[in-house]
């Protein structure tokens, strides 16, 4: 006899990285017939929704109109059908960005390199932070974490054409409070003429959609938002 229902999917729209004072919606998708959904924040009950009519609704939304550092953290949700509760969803890391200052991102030896060259990114922020994050724009979860007093070094090692793309970095004041994003740095990797062919660039989004592009997960490139379950799962661990 089944003691719990399958866990629901949780995700943030438009993105799990939310600029301060901007709005975000946390979505929780369970099953049709669920009479109650609970959103938990940092392990405590945060909000409850009871969809009507439950048999026609399998998703609820929890709206946060004004993002701030107090709302940033780990969220999960559960739902109930009759007296039976589901397993909790995976954790959603909701991050507040545009806090305090803007880091500077630079790349050595330069933004244009040959396949096989060693490349190092530097993210610098003079205010009190010791953790930095380097993100590559696009549909793949390219996130690196680095540490340093005012600057972190991100060695990419010998690059390939797969490293081509646009990078930004953040200073992190804690796991869920990040600085403004740096100006973008576009890395152009040219194939070594003798033995490397040019590979297609990782799909990227225009710079003005930086705040809304989606990171995928081990589930692959899913179009259905309900399957973007593990979006931030591995980001901060």
């Amino acid at each position: 006899q089944q003691q719990t229902l399958p866990k629901p999917f949780i995700w943030a729209e438009p993105h799990f990285m939310v600029p301060k004072e901007k709005q975000v919606t946390i979505c929780c998708q369970g099953n049709y017939g669920a009479v109650e959904y609970q959103l938990h924040f940092e392990g405590s009950l945060f909000a409850v929704d009871r969809p009507k009519p439950p048999e026609r609704i399998n998703k609820v939304q929890f709206y946060i109109p004004d993002m701030n550092s107090r709302m940033a953290g780990q969220y999960s949700c559960i739902y109930r059908v009759g007296e039976l509760w589901s397993e909790p969803s995976n954790l959603l890391d909701l991050v507040v960005t545009e806090m305090y200052d803007t880091p500077t991102l630079s790349v050595h030896p330069g933004p244009e390199v040959i396949s096989g060259e060693k490349v190092t990114f530097y993210c610098r922020l003079d205010t009190a932070t010791s953790m930095f994050l380097l993100l590559k724009e696009g549909r793949s979860s390219h996130v690196q974490r680095g540490y340093g007093k005012v600057q972190a070094e991100f060695p990419l090692g010998p690059v390939t054409t797969a490293h081509r793309g646009t990078y930004r970095c953040f200073g992190s004041y804690n796991n869920h409070a990040w600085s403004f994003p740096s100006e973008p740095v576009k890395l152009l990797v040219t194939g070594d003429i003798e033995n490397t062919s040019l590979a297609p660039e990782d799909p990227t989004f225009p710079a003005d959609t930086w705040g809304t592009y989606l990171l995928t997960t081990e589930t692959g490139l899913q179009k259905d938002h309900a399957l973007w379950d593990h979006t931030a799962q591995n980001l901060l661990r």
């Epitope: 050595h108 030896p109 040959i114 096989g116 060259e117 060693k118 190092t120 070094e153 060695p155 010998p158 070594d192």
Partner: nanobody, 118 residues
């Protein structure tokens, strides 16, 4: 303390060739990358060419591609820049630089002036 000393600069006519050398006081075979930069009057310093150590990967700025050739002789601890088909816009102070680990340009030379003029 490592020292880089450039030589070979001078005045040359457009279309002619020149070879710059950069002698290093330390052993260069273990250095990851060496490069040539230049700075024209009133402009910023820009990369001209660089060469990676063991892989011998060479990068050239678009403006010099096909005209300049970078090479290094680790047995002599020397970096070279062969410049041909020189143009007036190649006039600049040329600097040699060394990157021992692949992370930053650790050492710089004092520069040698190249003037391309008829």
């Amino acid at each position: 303390q490592v020292q880089l000393v450039e030589s070979g600069g001078g005045v040359v006519q457009p279309g002619r060739s020149l070879r710059l050398s950069c002698a290093a006081s330390g052993r260069t075979e273990s250095w990851y990358r060496m490069g040539w930069f230049r700075q024209a009057p009133g402009k910023g310093r820009e990369v001209v060419a660089r060469i990676s150590g063991d892989t011998n990967i060479k990068y050239y700025a678009g403006s010099v591609k096909g005209r300049f050739t970078i090479s290094r002789d680790n047995s002599k601890n020397t970096l070279y820049l062969q410049m041909s088909s020189l143009r007036a816009e190649d006039t600049a102070v040329y600097y040699c630089a060394a990157d021992r680990t692949g992370a930053t340009w650790d050492y710089w030379g004092q520069g040698t002036l190249v003037t391309v003029s008829s």
